[in-house]
Interface confidence: medium
């Protein structure tokens, strides 16, 4: 079955720049299928823009200005790229790639969509680092004692743009756990969001990960925030500044017993 | 030009109570097109639900039913037993793929219908209230309450900032909520909740334990992609309640 991944959840540009949005096709050879691009402007219907067929034929929707959009595909990386030239305010939208996928039963095709990339246009000069800054909250003693469950909370602050995806996994599992989240909130020129995960008592001794996808993550990779097991033996050490350094550096945690 | 028009912009549904979405076609006979339904959830994910010819997306066949009312020129999608997972925006779309002649393989979409899911009407349930802290940050966790109306107060004399609470449906079909704030005196912050004309305090749920019973991080930025800034504890930390732990991440 065909699967579409749009690695950029957002793409932030200043006016008149060029945006390149990527769509990675798996499960089907890209040179043996047609890839379609759709746009959803705020408050408008989702609209077909352009497609590139397996033989390289490009078809644009009538009424789309010529030279605005360019579509191509790179078989080596199984990627289709939508290029938007000379971006302007009216290009603010979420852009989806899509393809028709055959089902086992003959006559059945469905159009599957990628997760979308939101094009954001800004005139602001932002701080150098507008990636999400994480703070973790571990379960309160009261909750674990009284309810035989514990809630982890992952707070992300000072990020821009507002497009962010958060999910949770146990350390050695790829299964996405059922979590809950608040709305993304504006704080001055940046945004904050939090997500929480409640796990049964038997899972409290496992390490959990809050995984964050954001356009401005360092090196463009998902940020993994580690929640240590809470039933753990603790080694006494000299206090140090509570900073995290490089990804493979030792991280010092200051621990306290809270009674609430 | 052809247009697909949803019957409603917003449809509130109750968990377990069947709901019907309708989408009418203007300017053409619906029988000349194939109708598709999609759901867009938080984070913009567009998931295929149904296409004419009895095609359902993975996991949708048991709980959804697509239909066409030729006489009324409209498409119908029934959600047989809604759950909180069914919240999102629902889109009808059409194509003429395989209707003879040249294919129109593009989809023409209608505007979305926002489906909001509410718990079933049920006996009132008092919340449990817990406080979680990290440095100046305090979170008040309010669990398993019904009905939805609630006021959450983080009690402090030294507030830096507070955020609107997030109220969501819990997996058991009640409500959960979290309110976050930043306080200079986070150690002394408690949470009180007004619900159903009663007040519930986080202190009602405190467990009397000795200080070694349950150790947990005070404040950390524990991440595989560390940020450039450092959070230093602003609160006064009593050393008899502190351990230091070294973790390699």
């Amino acid at each position: 079955a065909g699967h579409l991944e749009q690695p950029q959840i957002s793409s932030t540009k200043t006016l008149s720049k060029t945006a390149r949005l990527e769509c990675v096709v798996s499960g089907i050879t890209i040179s043996a299928t047609s890839v379609y691009w759709y746009r959803e402007r705020p408050g408008e219907v989702i609209q077909f823009l352009v497609s590139i067929s397996y033989d390289g034929t490009v078809r644009k929707e009538s009424g789309i200005p010529s030279g605005k959009f360019e579509v191509d595909r790179i078989p080596e990386t199984s990627t289709s790229t939508l290029t938007i030239h000379n971006v302007e305010k009216q290009d603010i939208a979420t852009y989806y790639c899509a393809l028709w996928e055959a089902q086992q039963e003959l006559g059945k095709k469905i159009k599957v969509f990628g997760p979308g990339t939101k094009l954001i246009i800004t005139d602001k000069q932002l701080d150098a680092d507008v990636s999400p800054k994480p703070t973790i909250f571990l379960p309160s003693i009261a909750e674990t004692k009284l309810q035989k469950a514990g809630t982890y909370l992952c707070l992300l602050e000072k990020f821009f743009p507002d497009v962010i995806k958060i999910h949770w996994q146990e350390k050695k599992s790829n299964t996405i756990l059922g979590s809950q989240e608040g709305n993304t909130m504006k704080t001055n020129d940046t945004y904050m969001k939090f997500s929480w995960l409640t796990v049964p008592e038997k899972s409290l001794d496992k390490e959990h990960r809050c995984i964050v996808r954001h356009e401005n993550n360092k090196n463009g990779v998902d940020q993994e925030i580690i929640f240590p097991p809470i039933k753990t033996d603790v080694i006494t050490m000299d206090p140090k500044d509570n900073c995290s350094k490089d990804a493979n550096d030792t991280l010092l945690l200051q621990l306290t017993n809270t009674s609430a | 030009a052809i247009e697909l028009v949803p019957e409603h912009q917003t449809v509130p549904v109750s968990i377990g109570v069947p709901a019907t979405l309708r989408c009418s076609m203007k300017g053409e006979a619906i029988g000349n097109y194939y109708i598709n339904w999609y759901r867009k959830t938080q984070g913009n994910t567009m998931t295929f639900i149904y296409r004419e010819k009895d095609i359902y997306g993975p996991g949708f066949k048991d709980n959804f039913q697509g239909d066409i009312d030729i006489a009324k020129n409209l498409a119908v999608l029934k959600i047989l037993a809604p759950s909180e997972r069914d919240e999102g925006s629902y889109y009808c779309a059409c194509d003429t793929l395989g209707m003879g002649g040249e294919y129109t393989d593009k989809l023409i979409f209608g505007k979305g219908t926002r489906v909001t899911v509410e718990p079933r009407s049920q006996p009132h349930t008092k919340p449990s209230v817990f406080v979680m802290k990290n440095g100046t940050n305090v979170a008040c966790l309010v669990k398993e309450f019904y009905p939805k109306d609630i006021r959450i107060n983080l009690v402090s004399s030294k507030k830096i900032t507070e955020f609107d609470p997030a109220i969501v449906i819990s997996p058991s079909g009640k409500y959960n909520a979290v309110k976050l704030g930043k306080y200079e005196d986070s150690n002394s912050v408690t949470c009180s909740v007004q619900h159903d004309n009663k007040t519930v305090h986080s202190t009602d749920f405190e467990v009397k334990t000795d200080s070694t019973d349950h150790v947990k991080p005070k404040e950390t930025e524990n991440t595989k992609q560390p940020s450039k800034s450092c959070h230093k504890p602003k609160a006064i930390v009593h050393t008899e309640k502190v351990n230091m732990m070294s973790l390699t991440v």
């Epitope: 089907i28 043996a32 397996y54 033989d55 003959l106 | 010819k53 009895d54 294919y103």
Partner: antibody, heavy 124, light 112 residues
Framework: QVQLVQSGAEVKKPGSSVKVSCKAS????????ISWMRQAPGQGLEWMGG????????DYAQKFQGRVTITADKSTSTAYMELSSLRSEDTAVYYC?????????????????WGQGTMVTVSS | DIVMTQSPLSSPVDLGQPASISCRSS???????????LSWLQQRPGQPPRLLIY???NRFSGVPDRFSGSGAGTDFTLKISRVEAEDVGVYYC?????????LGGGTKVDIK
């Protein structure tokens, strides 16, 4: 009415590949599925796979997966079937066929128009 | 894969007499769209096959009305009401409900 004309007979060595073409005329090549079948001497018909040129995504029978490649060139209204790693048991007449027009888009499937067949002999 | 089983393997018939060929599928050929995608093909000696019947009982254009198809679900029959000399050949049933398309092993019809 669509007509299908296939390329001529081929003699191939074991381990090599063969590419058979099938040119359509007189109809809408893009919209109909092209199937490839084969028939070994004195044996029955076997479906190898097919393609709807409009989409270009081929469907293969599991037995041939990895050895067969079916493609289509809309500009010349020609479909191709390439079979690699040939062995003597691949000696057969290879047919292209199309399900033009009685039913729905994906039904290969009221296969009603056939090429004349291409004899492929695999021999050392 | 859906397995198609035909019987008999061979059917010698007198000219002008009826002939009947049976085809059984290993699972129902009823598609979720309500149609049953069972076809019958005829292959005369030295020629490519040709379509006779589609969707159980629909004769393809130009096919004489002495050919008829019937059946449902998993059991299907092709009948020739009066066999003529030009009907000599091998007859195949084929399912087009699911990938991969599969065919029966063939039934040879010849004149006694």
């Amino acid at each position: 009415q669509v007509q299908l004309v296939q390329s001529g007979a081929e003699v191939k060595k074991p381990g090599s590949s063969v590419k058979v073409s099938c040119k359509a005329s007189g109809g809408s090549f893009s919209n109909y599925a092209i199937s490839w079948m084969r028939q070994a001497p004195g044996q029955g018909l076997e479906w190898m796979g097919g393609i709807i040129p409009f989409f270009g995504t081929p469907d293969y029978a599991q037995k041939f997966q990895g050895r067969v490649t079916i493609t289509a060139d809309k500009s010349t209204s020609t479909a191709y079937m390439e079979l690699s790693s040939l062995r003597s048991e691949d000696t057969a007449v290879y047919y292209c066929s199309t399900g033009g027009g009685y039913g729905d888009y994906d039904y290969y499937y009221g296969i009603n128009v056939w090429g004349q067949g291409t004899m492929v002999t695999v021999s050392s | 894969d859906i397995v198609m089983t035909q019987s008999p393997l061979s059917s010698p018939v007198d000219l002008g007499q009826p002939a009947s060929i049976s085809c059984r599928s290993s699972q129902s050929l009823v598609h979720s769209d309500g149609n049953t995608y069972l076809s019958w093909l005829q292959q005369r000696p030295g020629q490519p096959p040709r379509l006779l019947i589609y969707k159980i009982s629909n004769r393809f254009s130009g096919v004489p009305d002495r050919f008829s198809g019937s059946g449902a679900g998993t059991d299907f029959t092709l009948k020739i009401s009066r066999v003529e000399a030009e009907d000599v050949g091998v007859y195949y049933c084929m399912q087009a409900k699911e990938f991969p398309l599969t065919l029966g092993g063939g039934t040879k019809v010849d004149i006694k």
